[in-house]
């Protein structure tokens, strides 16, 4: 059974992931980003189901495409280079989903824009955090 300290750690990691995803969304999804329209041409795959930490496997598999989109953005939009930002997210995702169980991600049929993709995973983080508090 999860201890209160492990639950707290999970909550903090989810909050960190949430902040990173929100920062990316805010950094790109505004009219001051001249490459927004180009970024919206990128296709992202969405999870069929995202209700548990193991489903973060689906986010992990889309981190490389996410980095490619962020490479279009001006570095001033974020406090870190895209490679470092994605690396940080990857570390959190690996810790949260755990590496001992192998989970095959199932994707929904419909693809999504980067804005829809980020909003989906932001909602996921908020939902899991709410169950932990």
């Amino acid at each position: 059974a999860p201890t209160s300290s492990s639950t707290k750690k999970t909550q903090l990691q989810l909050e960190h992931l949430l902040l990173d995803l929100q920062m990316i969304l805010n950094g790109i999804n505004n009219y001051k980003n001249p490459k927004l329209t180009r970024m919206l041409t990128f296709k992202f795959y969405m999870p069929k189901k995202a209700t548990e930490l193991k489903h973060l496997q689906c986010l992990e598999e889309e981190l490389k495409p996410l980095e490619e989109v962020l490479n279009l953005a001006q570095s001033k939009n974020f406090h870190l280079r895209p490679r470092d930002l994605i690396s940080n997210i990857n570390v959190i995702v690996l810790e949260l989903k755990g590496s001992e169980t192998t989970f095959m991600c199932e994707y929904a049929d419909e693809t999504a824009t980067i804005v829809e993709f980020l909003n989906r995973w932001i909602t996921f983080c908020q939902s899991i955090i709410s169950t932990l508090t």
Epitope: Y31, P34, T37, R38, F42, E68, N71, T111
Partner: antibody, heavy 118, light 109 residues
């Protein structure tokens, strides 16, 4: 309604020309803008992109160093300054608005013909 | 440089289904957009994000994408659909805006 009205095309024996695109019906200063051209009987070719405030500009290789895009947000107007014109620049030039929700151009001007003769 | 490849022309009789394809190496990871351009007019978007229809576009226009191929389908083509159709997307890095060469749709009335 949302509109882009173009002016400034014409016949040019080489040299320079400036195109204008007047925007109305939307907050011009909130949108990145483009120029797209179409040579007679040919397809569409993206030419240049300018950010909402004019601070960032991007050009197709075919016009780099010769064309300059600019904007005056106080006048809701986009410009394309074309220098060192070549015969292959002969085309209909369209101004087009970058969508902030779709990954493409959602509003287009009516187009203006530029003819370059050597 | 990145290219989107379309057939130069497609012909159908009124009421038939017209299919226009667009091929590009980056399309598995890029959305395709479709523009209709009638003679002497500016282009009008008829499909965005592979398969979505902007407001005001008739239901007979639909789009799909699989692998490196995007397809514009006009089910029950009408004489007024006669136009040039261009697919649009960006290269793999997203930096270069690219139009296909265009397809002339003839509706044999």
């Amino acid at each position: 309604q949302v509109q882009l009205v173009q002016s400034g095309g014409g016949w040019q024996p080489g040299r320079s020309l400036r195109l204008s695109c007047a925007a109305s019906g939307f907050t011009f200063s909130n949108y990145a803008m483009n120029w797209v051209r179409q040579a007679p009987g040919k397809g569409l070719e993206w030419v240049t992109l300018i950010s909402y405030d004019g601070s960032q500009k991007y050009y197709a290789d075919s016009v780099k160093g010769r064309f300059t895009t600019s904007r005056d947000n106080s006048k809701n107007t986009l410009y394309l300054q074309m220098n060192s014109l070549r015969a292959e620049d002969t085309a209909v030039y369209y101004c087009a608005r970058d969508s902030t929700t779709l990954g493409a151009f959602d509003v287009w001007g009516q187009g203006t013909m530029v003819t370059v003769s050597s | 440089s990145y290219e989107l490849t379309q057939p130069p022309s497609v012909s159908v009789s009124p009421g038939q289904t017209a299919r226009i394809t667009c091929s590009g190496d980056a399309l598995p990871r890029k959305f395709a957009y479709w523009y209709q351009q009638k003679s002497g007019q500016a282009p009008v978007m008829v499909i965005y994000e592979d398969s979505k229809r902007p407001p005001g576009i008739p239901e007979r226009f639909s789009g799909s994408s699989s692998g490196t191929m995007a397809t514009l389908t006009i089910t029950g083509a009408q004489v007024e659909d006669e136009a040039d159709y261009y697919c649009y997307s960006t290269d793999s890095g997203g930096d270069v805006s690219v139009f296909g060469g265009g397809t002339k749709l003839t509706v044999l009335g």
